[in-house]
């Protein structure tokens, strides 16, 4: 376990070999989750890229946060995709949080502390626990089949995950840098493996 506080993973160039694999202590399937993270890239007006890829053996896009060029954020659960449009692209560090719950299918998507309109996806579904969680690449199969044109070029950090839906107050606290206790992925006690050309550097966001 490593305390990654105030650090970020840096992916300096496009590749299909560089990634970070995150280890999560999941023992049972997820009926809800929240993922929060920071990232920083210049790619958004050029092409799509993967931000957070969680694959199981039955479904490579079990959870996927992806930037889709000309549209905005693509969020996938269990292979089903919804879009959160971003009308104007700016090059700046971004903080996102997204949550999903099986009981209602409700998805929340927060960008820099501001909520988007809630949407619905995969009501009644359960997310598999035996997962390959990858930063920097989009998995087209469990733990692999990466395509360079979907890779992240830039920085990513503060990746935290919970097995429940955070309240708006809690998401606001996280965005403002307040205290929190993630129970699936914890950036302050991170188990991970680096493959290829990935560097750990001080974070560039406040």
């Amino acid at each position: 376990q490593t305390d990654m506080s105030r650090k970020a993973f840096v992916f300096p160039k496009e590749s299909d070999t560089s990634y970070v694999s995150l280890k999560a202590p999941l023992t049972k399937p997820l009926k809800a989750f929240t993922v929060c993270l920071h990232f920083y890239t210049e790619l958004s007006s050029t092409r799509g890229y993967s931000i957070f890829s969680y694959a199981t053996k039955r479904q490579d896009n079990e959870i996927l946060i992806f930037w889709s060029k000309d549209i905005g954020y693509s969020f996938t659960v269990g292979g089903s995709e919804i879009l959160f449009e971003v009308p104007e692209v700016t090059v700046a560090p971004v903080h996102i949080c997204t949550s999903w719950e099986s009981a209602s299918g409700i998805v929340e998507f927060w960008v820099d502390g501001k909520p988007r309109v809630r949407k619905s996806l995969k009501k009644g579904y359960t997310v598999g626990a035996e997962a390959s969680i990858i930063l920097g690449q989009e998995q087209d199969s469990f733990g692999g089949n990466f395509e360079g044109s979907q890779s992240l070029v830039g920085d990513i950090g503060n990746v935290n995950m919970w097995d429940f839906v955070l309240s708006p107050d809690e998401i606001n606290t996280i965005y403002l840098g307040g205290p929190f206790s993630p129970n699936v992925l914890n950036w302050r006690a991170l188990k991970y493996e680096v493959q290829g050309e990935v560097f750990t550097k001080p974070q560039l966001w406040p």
């Epitope: 799509g48 896009n61 060029k69 996938t76 292979g79 995709e81 087209d140 044109s149």
Partner: nanobody, 119 residues
Framework: EVQLQQSGPELVKPGASVKISCKAS????????MNWVKQSHGKSLEWIGN????????IYNQNFKDKATLTVDRSSRTAYMELHSLTSEDSAVYYC????????????WGQGTLVTVSA
């Protein structure tokens, strides 16, 4: 459920152009290349080319480089193929089919669009 829904049949005059569409649903659009295939009457299938919806990059069969233009509209999850300077040789059924970048086969196909070139 994965579906590729193509536009309806077209009757066009020689020398004209035609643009046919393929609307995708039931999967992450950016994750698969969209291929186009020609089937002329009594002939085997010919691969025209593909487009990567993630980057807009295209790859063409050299035989169709000046005949077809492949594009995508991500917001509507639709792929398009425009055929130029049509002749009777271009009369055929045209199919869209999706593939992963590493797959040599196409698991899902559209229903086909019949293009008839006639004066």
């Amino acid at each position: 459920e994965v579906q590729l829904q193509q536009s309806g049949p077209e009757l066009v005059k020689p020398g004209a152009s035609v643009k046919i569409s393929c609307k995708a649903s039931g999967y992450m659009f950016s994750d698969y290349y969209m291929n186009w295939v020609k089937q002329s009457h009594g002939k085997s299938l010919e691969w025209i080319g593909n487009v990567d919806p993630n980057t807009d990059n295209t790859i063409y069969n050299q035989n169709f480089k000046d005949k077809a233009t492949l594009t995508v509209d991500r917001s509507s999850r639709t792929a398009y193929m425009e055929l130029h300077s049509l002749t009777s040789e271009d009369s055929a059924v045209y199919y869209c089919a999706r593939s992963r970048f590493y797959d040599p086969w196409f698991a899902y196909w559209g229903q086909g669009t019949l293009v008839t070139v006639s004066a």
